[in-house]
Interface confidence: low
């Protein structure tokens, strides 16, 4: 009876997310059969988040809108470990928008989810950011420094990375 009601709850929760994502991939967290964490198929998962690499080329604004339609945001990178995970899924000859922008061109960088911008956890390429008119951040590969961030014009189309919290059922 308990298992039945748990299953019914799960199904109703899954139905909630169907408008965004018709298919979810779920894994059992720990040893407790009750705890399942899910990411939309074919998103990847790391710790408590899901990630999607969008290969469509769009402006920063449209990239963020594209993520938001999927119930996500452009990626907010909180740790070196998170960045190391993300770059495994990126192509070296491409650039990807992050959820980081400087709307006023005053070097007041803001993450899309209002996470405080912490200078100690940033991965700018050397010499970046370097232009007050370049108000959006990308991650790209430079042979000398490998993967890092660069500021670019927000209207220039790029690929992007979306991030959302895992769905727990």
């Amino acid at each position: 009876n308990f298992m039945y009601s748990k299953t019914v709850k799960r199904l109703s929760k899954l139905r909630e997310y169907q408008q965004y994502h018709p298919s979810l991939t779920c894994v059992m967290e720990g040893k407790d059969i009750e705890d399942w964490s899910c990411c939309p198929t074919p998103w990847t998962s790391f710790q408590s988040s899901c990630y999607f690499i969008s290969t469509g080329m769009q402006s920063w604004t449209k990239s963020q809108k594209n993520c938001s339609v999927m119930g996500a945001d452009l990626v907010v990178i909180n740790t070196r470990e998170e960045q190391d995970f993300i770059i495994q899924n990126l192509k070296r000859n491409s650039s990807y928008f992050l959820g980081l922008s400087d709307p006023g061109g005053r070097r007041h960088w803001q993450w899309v989810d209002q996470t405080p911008y912490n200078e100690n956890v940033t991965f700018w390429h050397s010499g970046e950011p370097n232009n007050l008119d370049e108000r959006c951040a990308i991650i790209n590969f430079r042979s000398s420094e490998e993967w890092g961030w660069n500021d670019i014009h927000c209207h220039v189309p790029q690929k992007s990375i979306c991030k959302m919290k895992k769905i727990y059922i």
């Epitope: 909630e16 997310y17 408008q19 965004y20 402006s59 604004t61 963020q64 809108k65 938001s68 339609v69 119930g71 959820g99 922008s101 709307p103 006023g104 005053r106 007041h108 803001q110 993450w111 899309v112 989810d113 209002q114 927000c154 209207h155 959302m164 919290k165």
Partner: antibody
Framework: QVQLVESGGGVVQPGRSLRLSCAAS????????MHWVRQAPGKGLEWVAV????????YYADSVKGRFTISRDNSKNTLYLQVNSLRAEDTAVYYC?????????????WGRGTLVTVSS | EIVLTQSPATLSLSPGERATLSCRAS??????LAWYQQKPGQAPRLLIY???NRATGIPARFSGSGSGTDFTLTISSLEPEDFAVYYC??????????FGQGTKLEIK
């Protein structure tokens, strides 16, 4: 003092136009996305439009798309809403509001509003 | 578009009491929900953003909770100035940004 002051409202006949203005003071308008939100008499809030800090991106509610145009003049610290082909259901107090967060999801500073009455 | 439904439509309480206002979304909005307070003849004021973060200058008696489709605004001990209309607003899927229809908090 950080504030927004709307103007340009009034009584207008159906089908006519108005231009609403919102003057910002105490902060730099060019650093913020800006919204218009309206409220019909005795009713709830309805989001109308948003414009990005640089004016390059604009989004509208379906109910006003094609009739209303949001614009800004950062050099004058002023936001505008051009309202055309007005209908009775457009009667409302129109508020300008500053967007907070990126990209401007919530409204952290509001003007006192300007009343638009559409009546023949 | 995402529809937000607030309940109750009117809540009658006395100063000092605890107020619990509800906002339900027609589909999941994650934690991307804000609460506003509006007094008669005034513009709305941002209270809570992203479900549980208090906006600048908002007293600690205001708190928000919830995620997915069900959200709650709690005022732990009502002050006379708290009697007003409260709106929730989502930013999960836009445009449009949508508001609930409002809950009127009145003095009993």
């Amino acid at each position: 003092q950080v504030q927004l002051v709307e103007s340009g409202g009034g009584v207008v006949q159906p089908g006519r136009s108005l231009r609403l203005s919102c003057a910002a003071s105490g902060f730099t308008l060019s650093s913020y996305g800006m919204h218009w939100v309206r409220q019909a008499p005795g009713k709830g809030l309805e989001w109308v439009a948003v414009i990005w800090y640089d004016g390059n991106d604009k989004y509208y509610a379906d109910s006003v798309k094609g009739r209303f145009t949001i614009s800004r003049d950062n050099s004058k610290n002023t936001l505008y809403l051009q309202v055309n082909s007005l209908r009775a259901e457009d009667t409302a107090v129109y508020y300008c509001a500053r967007g907070t967060g990126t990209p401007y999801w919530y409204f952290d500073l509001w003007g006192r509003g300007t009343l638009v009455t559409v009546s023949s | 578009e995402i529809v937000l439904t607030q309940s109750p439509a009117t809540l009658s309480l006395s100063p000092g009491e605890r107020a619990t206002l509800s906002c339900r979304a027609s589909q999941s909005v994650n934690n991307y929900l804000a609460w506003y307070q509006q007094k008669p003849g005034q513009a709305p004021r941002l209270l809570i953003y992203d479900a549980s973060n208090r906006a600048t200058g908002i007293p600690a008696r205001f708190s928000g909770s919830g995620s997915g489709t069900d959200f709650t605004l709690t005022i732990s001990s009502l002050e006379p100035e708290d009697f007003a209309v409260y709106y929730c607003q989502q930013r999960s899927t836009w445009p449009p940004y949508t508001f609930g229809q409002g809950t009127k908090l009145e003095i009993k």
